[in-house]
């Protein structure tokens, strides 16, 4: 984008690449120091945090955040009502569940109150920014002499989530990974009764209800089997 701006008095000036916010024709409309990027994450569709790097500003500034939903019944501009702070400077905004509309385009605007023409607007698809809580209540069932089934619960609509199971024995250097769809269960067909197994799971809001890239935190690990292998070097690291 190489933009030529015709200024009110007829001055022409060519600018470098930058994001132009809409300005009236009678106003200065020029490149300004970019505002920090806003990053939003919706936590389990219970609340949303939109944050920015306040330390990137040339001087400590309480930037303000406004938001609305594009082309919807919720298109009224809203002020942030719950700011997050870093060293007494605004660095984010928390929105509550009633203010979150996953399937409408979320528009977030950051503004410098000392110079309100210095503003940046971003459009976000919230369904791609959901991070579920970590899976809970991991349980293991022995289906047969050599087969284990891992089950877990999520505090969200199960059909909206995919999962990643990791497991390893006390002899393994690395985790073995297995993707699991919305069914939230995993079977390990061949278990060595002489080894101690550790399992953990994380979940993602993908692909049926959204296309989120961020995984939840890992669940608390759950263990199975012998823990009598004294000479094994990995055991204590696993339990840390």
């Amino acid at each position: 984008l190489n933009t030529t701006i015709l200024t009110p008095n007829g001055n022409e000036d060519t600018t470098a690449d930058f994001f132009l916010t809409t300005m009236p024709t009678d106003s200065l409309s020029v490149s300004t120091l970019p505002l920090p990027e806003v990053q939003c994450f919706v936590f389990n569709v219970e609340y949303m945090n939109c944050t920015w790097n306040s330390s990137s500003e040339p001087q400590p500034t309480n930037l303000t955040l406004h938001y609305w939903y594009k082309n919807s019944d919720n298109d009224k501009v809203q002020k942030c009502s719950h700011y997050l702070f870093s060293e007494e400077i605004t660095s984010g905004c928390q929105l509550q569940k009633k203010e979150i509309h996953l399937y409408q385009t979320f528009v977030v605007q950051l503004q410098d109150p000392r110079e309100p023409r210095r503003q940046a607007t971003q459009m976000l698809k919230l369904q791609n920014l959901v991070i579920p809580w970590a899976p809970e209540n991991l349980t293991l069932h022995k289906l047969s002499e050599s087969q284990l089934e891992l089950n877990w619960n999520n505090r969200f609509l199960n059909h909206c989530l995919e999962h990643l199971v990791q497991y390893r024995t006390d002899w393994d250097h690395s985790w073995t990974e297995q993707s699991v769809d919305y069914r939230h269960k995993f079977s390990l067909p061949s278990v060595d009764g002489q080894k101690r197994y550790t399992f953990r799971v994380r979940s993602r809001f993908n692909p049926l209800c959204g296309s989120a890239q961020h995984w939840s935190e890992w669940s608390h690990p759950i263990h199975w089997g012998s823990n009598t292998s004294k000479e094994n070097p990995f055991l204590f690291a696993l339990e840390a």
Epitope: T7, D13, D26, V30, D112, R117
Partner: antibody
């Protein structure tokens, strides 16, 4: 602390050139728009020119357009005003000033006198 | 081009008394974002100008509370609730809505 130290003023004949400098310290120079403002002897303030933080935009008062050029070197933390084809009416104290964008000039240089006289 | 007009041009004031300076613009300074782009500066004798108020009513850092600004559109006012001897100098309003940026002609405040 923020400082804007000006240099380059002096006496010059009509039609000649002069370059003013404004050395900045105590802040992130490359984050601020910079302006030149002048004040003729016994008169009020007149805005001359502005340059954006990255040098991509420049605006001028009609009275200096085509004769004066505002520029900056962010690696040297210095603002310049190249004044060509000087006229008697350009005689003034020239101030540099910083602004986060284009409003409110929160710090000013000490001023440097430019006298255009034959 | 926006023309800024101040009144009065000279303002003799007794210390402790209030003072008021008017500034008018030839066009509205109200931006579509709801803010008026008007600043006030004070130039004390022999000094560079200093910022007093920005966006009409925001006091710059270190400016005493006795200074206040008001107005919208084309009519603006700078008020000093109780003038002190250190307030002497020339007061300028300035519009930064559009280029060329422009100052008022200045109001000289002096102590009676």
């Amino acid at each position: 602390q923020v400082q804007l130290v000006q240099s380059g003023g002096g006496v010059v004949q009509p039609g000649r050139s002069l370059r003013l400098s404004c050395a900045a310290s105590g802040f992130t120079f490359s984050s601020y728009a910079m302006h030149w403002v002048r004040q003729a002897p016994g008169k009020g303030l007149e805005w001359v020119a502005v340059i954006s933080y990255d040098g991509s935009n420049k605006y001028y008062a009609d009275s200096v357009k085509g004769r004066f050029t505002i520029s900056r070197d962010n690696s040297k933390n210095t603002l310049y005003l190249q004044m060509n084809s000087l006229r008697a009416e350009d005689t003034a104290v020239y101030y540099c000033a910083r602004s986060l964008y284009y409003s409110h000039f929160d710090y000013w240089g000490q001023g440097t006198l430019v006298t255009v006289s034959s | 081009e926006i023309v800024m007009t101040q009144s009065p041009l000279s303002l003799p004031v007794t210390p402790g008394e209030p003072a008021s300076i008017s500034c008018r613009s030839s066009q509205s300074l109200l931006h579509s974002n709801g803010y008026n782009y008007l600043d006030w500066y004070l130039q004390k004798p022999g000094q560079s100008p200093q910022l007093l108020m920005y966006l009409v009513s925001n006091r710059a850092s270190g400016v005493p509370e006795r200074f206040s600004g008001s107005g919208s559109g084309t009519d603006f006012t700078l008020k000093i609730s109780r003038v002190e001897a250190e307030d002497v100098g020339v007061y300028y309003c300035m519009q930064t809505l559009q280029t060329p940026l422009s100052f008022g002609q200045g109001t000289k405040l002096e102590i009676k």
